[in-house]
Amino acid sequence: MQGQCSVPNELNSNLKLQCPDGYAIGSECATSCLDHNSESIILPMNVTVRDIPHWLNPTRVERVVCTAGLKWYPHPALIHCVKGCEPFMGDNYCDAINNRAFCNYDGGDCCTSTVKTKKVTPFPMSCDLQGDCACRDPQAQEHSRKDLRGYSHG
């Protein structure tokens, strides 16, 4: 089969594609982000980076491929760069920046039922225990109906 995909040029901000093998069918382009601590992920059509809900766990993507139909897969327009996870998950401090499904809710550090010390300690220190450092993990005991009154966020 012959032909090639068009040069992927309408990229979302901070996304970079490297296509060492060109754009022929079967060629792969590596995805990366200009910001060193961001990761390339696929978002649904109606979701932007600015309004990703904490419960959304987008799929990481490392490459796109030129298909036989001369289309890139996944489509580059669906690939975005999001803040990566800081390497402080499961260390007994609830890091606001990691309190999202994509970072496994900071490894359990933001819920009384899952943090090892059984006391949520926020970081930054001013992080609101009812806001960015709240217990958001839907799997935590705090969110099972029978235990709703059994745990506090403090």
């Epitope: 910001d35 060193h36 800081e86 007994n92 010390t117 006391k119 220190m125 001013s126």
Partner: antibody, heavy 119, light 107 residues
């Protein structure tokens, strides 16, 4: 008057152990976290770690993890910084500083403890 | 870790003049930025927190601005007691990091 009073200057040999202290007074110790900051001679400030008032959870900057131990005894309103085996590169002034639990910035600092490590 | 870069390393200013110090973060820290003043043989003193809020007892000639990655400390009219080293610090992402400092000296 709110104060953080640190223990006095120390001169040690490489390989020796050391524990320096920071005693808080004039405020409720359990309403504040305590941080430790290093300043090597002629150099800038380096954040070492913090401890919350319960004394059970300390958090270390990666470059100090495993090199020092931060602890606290809330019954005597005192935080500690200790080394099990000092190195010449540990020579520095060490400051303790306190911050309110819902604040990210230390509002009161100790006077500093000079630690000299030399053979 | 987030790297904080201060410029210039040394600033020579005459008393009464305006001093502008810069601090750049390697990634966004929102408005989580503090400025400290340190004089020889003394502990640092908090001047500004959350980017632009003056700490208790700090004179109005000190002001902070900026957010994200670019921050500025301005001293509107330098007094003799303002000659010191100034550090910026971010407490947004662990580890907390300081800039290398800017020394403000008499011209």
């Amino acid at each position: 008057e709110v104060q953080l009073v640190q223990s006095g200057a120390e001169v040690k040999k490489p390989g020796e152990s050391l524990k320096i202290s920071c005693k808080g007074s004039g405020y409720s110790f359990t309403s504040y976290w305590t941080g430790w900051v290093r300043q090597a001679p002629g150099k800038g400030l380096e954040w070492m770690g913090i401890i919350y008032p319960g004394g059970s959870v300390a958090r270390y900057s990666p470059s100090f993890q495993g090199q020092v131990t931060i602890s606290a005894d809330k019954s005597i309103s005192t935080a500690y910084l200790q080394w099990s085996s000092l190195k010449a590169s540990d020579t520095a002034v060490y400051y303790c500083a306190r911050g309110p639990l819902r604040s990210d910035y230390p509002d009161v600092w100790g006077q500093g403890t000079m630690v000299t490590v030399s053979s | 870790e987030i790297v904080m870069t201060q410029s210039p390393a040394t600033l020579s200013v005459s008393p009464g003049e305006r001093a502008t110090l810069s601090c750049r973060a390697s990634q966004s820290v929102g408005s989580y930025l503090a400025w400290y003043q340190q004089k020889p043989g003394q502990a640092p003193r908090l001047l500004i927190y959350r980017g632009s809020t003056r700490a208790t007892g700090i004179p109005a000639r000190f002001s902070g601005s900026g957010s994200g990655t670019e921050f500025t400390l301005t001293i509107s009219s330098l007094q003799s007691e303002d000659f010191a080293v100034y550090y910026c610090q971010q407490p947004y992402v662990w580890p907390i990091t300081f800039g290398g400092g800017t020394k403000v000296e008499i011209k």
